[in-house]
Structure formats: structure tokens, C-alpha cells
């Protein structure tokens, strides 16, 4: 079951998953000037059995300018640099978390992927919060959020974290001091990891009382 909403927003904080539950989708997106290969996958999917989980499908990008020429999928060593993953940079994966049964690790980068990764989380997913550079964490409780199903609806628990404007960075649970903290991003960019299904739309078909997610019309 996909989580309907985004994880909660905490002012001056970003979040990331240490590992991804089976059923998680990752959009296959390419950077500007590149596109998915013909007949390519639209997304990767974390799948597995009781003993092993892995990402199904491979995202592949090819130059928009050329036809039928596929760029290599496995990045060269010099390309394996820090990348944005969901709202975070540089996935710092504690082995114990990434090796959880029924979970996938952060997928390796593919060549010419978009600068931002979009994940679609499933029920039971946990994300961890960290204050952005220049802010210090005041913990009232766990700095994490879990997607839970209650009464047939999904919801994210509220992380107990306040980020205050002091020049000191916080760390993820169990981490040593990071060499560099993730930079904060403009608020307009911190949207939409998953979306709500509670779209209430009145269609122009007044004869029915149905609601639907989209209204279509031609111009």
C-alpha cells in the first residue's frame, strides 16, 4: 500500500530513508538533454523474497539529440559522487539498517539521471530527519516519521524535532560527525514525494454527484 501523503515538513529540516521497503517505487528520470530509452522502465521497484530484496528494472537514459544510442547504465567511478536522494544528499547507509529484511539499499546512480530522486513510499516506511546546515536540533523525541495505516487511511507520524538557528549541525541517529552536512533547499523544491488520494474534485457533469480526481476540457 502506497503512502498517500508526503512525510511531514519540519522547518529547516530535511529527511531521508536509510533503506526502502519492498514496494517502494523510484521514478526513472533523466537530466536535461536526456530521456529514457525507448521501451525503458518508468520506475524502479524494490522487490524481493524472504531472504533478499533488490531493485527491479534499471533506469536508462539516452541523449535526446540521438536516436537508438543508449548510454551505459553503470556509472564510471568518477561519476559516483554525492547525489540528491529525495530531499537529501549523500545517502549515509548504516549497514544494519540497509540490510533489513524486506528492504532495499539506496539504488546506485545511473548515468545522466536527474539531480533529484523521487521515491514513492509504502506503509511501514521510516524516514529520518536532520536539520539543514546552520541549524541545530532540539529533540523532544524521535527525529523520525513512520508511514502507518489507520482506519484504511495512511498517515505519517509526527517527528519530534525542532531546528533552531544556531551554527551547529545535527546528525542522524548513530552517525559520526558528517564531513559535510546536506544543504538546505528552497521550500518550493521540498514537495511531493508521494501524493494524496483524497482529491475532492467536482466535475462539470452536474447531472452526477460523483467526484473525480481530474476534470478535462478542451480549449
Amino acid at each position: 500500500e502506497l503512502c498517500d501523503d508526503d512525510p511531514p515538513e519540519i522547518p529547516h529540516a530535511t529527511f531521508k530513508a536509510m533503506a526502502y521497503k519492498e514496494g517502494t517505487m523510484l521514478n526513472c528520470e533523466c537530466k536535461r538533454g536526456f530521456r529514457r530509452i525507448k521501451s525503458g522502465s518508468l520506475y524502479m521497484l524494490c522487490t524481493g523474497n524472504s531472504s533478499h530484496s533488490s531493485w527491479d528494472n534499471q533506469c536508462q537514459c539516452t541523449s535526446s539529440a540521438t536516436r537508438n544510442t543508449t548510454k551505459q547504465v553503470t556509472p564510471q567511478p568518477e561519476e559516483q559522487k554525492e547525489r540528491k536522494t529525495t530531499e537529501m544528499q549523500s545517502p549515509m547507509q548504516p549497514v544494519d539498517q540497509a540490510s533489513l529484511p524486506g528492504h532495499c539499499r539506496e539504488p546506485p546512480p545511473w548515468e545522466n539521471e536527474a539531480t533529484e530522486r523521487i521515491y514513492h513510499f509504502v506503509v511501514g516506511q521510516m524516514v529520518y530527519y536532520q536539520c539543514v546546515q546552520g541549524y541545530r536540533a532540539l529533540h523532544r523525541g524521535p527525529a523520525e516519521s513512520v508511514c502507518k495505516m489507520t482506519h484504511g487511511k495512511t498517515r505519517w507520524t509526527q517527528p519530534q524535532l525542532i531546528c533552531t538557528g544556531e551554527m551547529e549541525t545535527s546528525q542522524f541517529p548513530g552517525e559520526e560527525k558528517p564531513q559535510a552536512s546536506p544543504e538546505g533547499r528552497p521550500e518550493s523544491e521540498t514537495s511531493c514525494l508521494v501524493t494524496t488520494t483524497d482529491f475532492q474534485i467536482q466535475t462539470e457533469m452536474a447531472a452526477t454527484m460523483e467526484t473525480s480526481i481530474f476534470t478535462t476540457e478542451y480549449q
Epitope: 518508468l42 501524493t195 494524496t196
Partner: antibody, heavy 104, light 107 residues
């Protein structure tokens, strides 16, 4: 025939998401045909080869609206055009009511 | 492109009947298959995703199975509201493709 049509698809009551918006058409008495889709947060569109060069799918995040423009219309483009929220592996779970386009 | 072939193209059945519709893919699509129901003048409705997972709100008399190239959707006891056209759809690769549809009619 020969003209263009632009169909709009507005989402409201929630965030205009990172899921794809797919466009599917259905000619009278025929089956469903996927034309293409777009992920609004990225703005990149993906088209079925059959429509490549004739269809343009765009999205305006500020108004939570996706658009499908089909050019060089011919009589066989007469169909109902649907938009749908496409959750990939999890299916197209919510659909618009459809827009009938008649080319005559 | 992956071709989805549905059979039968139409069938007649009575209320209470067990109905099975088959969908075959031209290549393996693992379990990347969805089923939709469409009634006249209405938009399609998602019934089953990932070959066998029931969409929220869909009655439990609907079930799906299969993996690779062969898939089925079964209605265990046909109800009056189930008379409609049923489509399969693969999400394994682009372009996304649908089966030709199966029209379930009243006998």
C-alpha cells in the same frame, strides 16, 4: 481535419504530485490506447511512438493542470480523451471524466 | 512494443456464475499487470494492480493471478453491477499497452 486540439486536466484538493499523469484515448466502440504521460514535478513527457511528433503533453504546477495537445487532426482521432493519475506498478487509480473530441 | 492479448473478446454469463478472463503478454512482464473495469459512458476503474493486489474498495469476489506472460482475472460470483468491459494493462515498459478488452454480457 488538420487542426489541433488542446485538452486540459485539472487536479484539485491535493498536491500536484510526483506521480505521472497519463493520457489515454478511446475511439468509439474501441479499446483503450495510451498516448503518453508526464511527471509534473519534472516536466518531462513520454510519448507512444504512434503519436510522436503530433502530441505534446505539458503540465503547469502553479495551476495543477496537465495538458495534451494533438495536432494535424484526422477523422480517426475522434475519441474520448482521458487523463489519469498513473501510479505505475500500482495502476492508474483515478481518472478524469473524459473529453469527447470529434474531428469532422 | 509489448502486445497484450485478451480472451475471450466477449462472453455471456448469468448472475452467480464464476467468470475468468485471460490476458497474455508477448513477452515476460513479471507481475507488472493491472486490470480495469469500464462501464458504458464511464471512465475505466482500477480493479487489480500488480497482477493480484485488489485495489481499495473493490469487492473481494474479484481476484487476479499470474506472472510472466499469462494472467487471469476471476469474478467468483457474478453480480449485476459486474457486467462491463474488462481491460488488462502492462506497466513493465513504455509504451504502456492495454489488452483489447473482454465484454462481459448478461446471458
Amino acid at each position: 481535419p488538420g487542426s489541433s486540439v488542446k485538452v486540459s486536466c485539472k487536479a484539485s484538493g491535493g498536491t500536484f504530485s510526483s506521480y505521472a499523469i497519463s493520457w489515454v484515448r478511446q475511439a468509439p466502440g474501441q479499446g483503450l490506447e495510451w498516448m503518453g504521460g508526464i511527471i509534473p514535478i519534472f516536466g518531462t513527457a513520454n510519448y507512444a511512438q504512434k503519436f510522436q511528433g503530433r502530441v505534446t503533453i505539458t503540465a503547469d504546477k502553479s495551476t495543477s493542470t496537465a495538458y495534451m495537445e494533438l495536432s494535424s487532426l484526422r477523422s480517426e482521432d475522434t475519441a474520448v480523451y482521458y487523463c489519469a493519475r498513473d501510479k505505475g506498478y500500482y495502476g492508474m487509480d483515478v481518472w478524469g471524466q473524459g473529453t469527447t473530441v470529434t474531428v469532422s | 512494443d509489448i502486445v497484450m492479448t485478451q480472451s475471450p473478446s466477449s462472453l455471456s454469463a448469468s448472475i452467480g456464475d464464476r467468470v475468468t478472463i485471460t490476458c497474455r503478454a508477448s513477452q515476460s512482464i513479471k507481475n507488472y499487470l493491472n486490470w480495469y473495469q469500464q462501464k458504458p459512458g464511464k471512465a475505466p476503474k482500477l480493479l487489480i494492480y500488480a497482477a493480484s493486489s485488489l485495489q481499495n474498495g473493490v469487492p473481494s469476489r474479484f481476484s487476479g493471478s499470474g506472472s510472466g506472460t499469462d494472467f487471469t482475472v476471476t469474478i467468483s460470483s457474478l453480480q449485476p453491477e459486474d457486467f462491463a468491459i474488462y481491460y488488462c494493462q502492462q506497466t513493465y515498459s513504455t509504451p504502456l499497452t492495454f489488452g483489447g478488452g473482454t465484454n462481459v454480457e448478461i446471458k
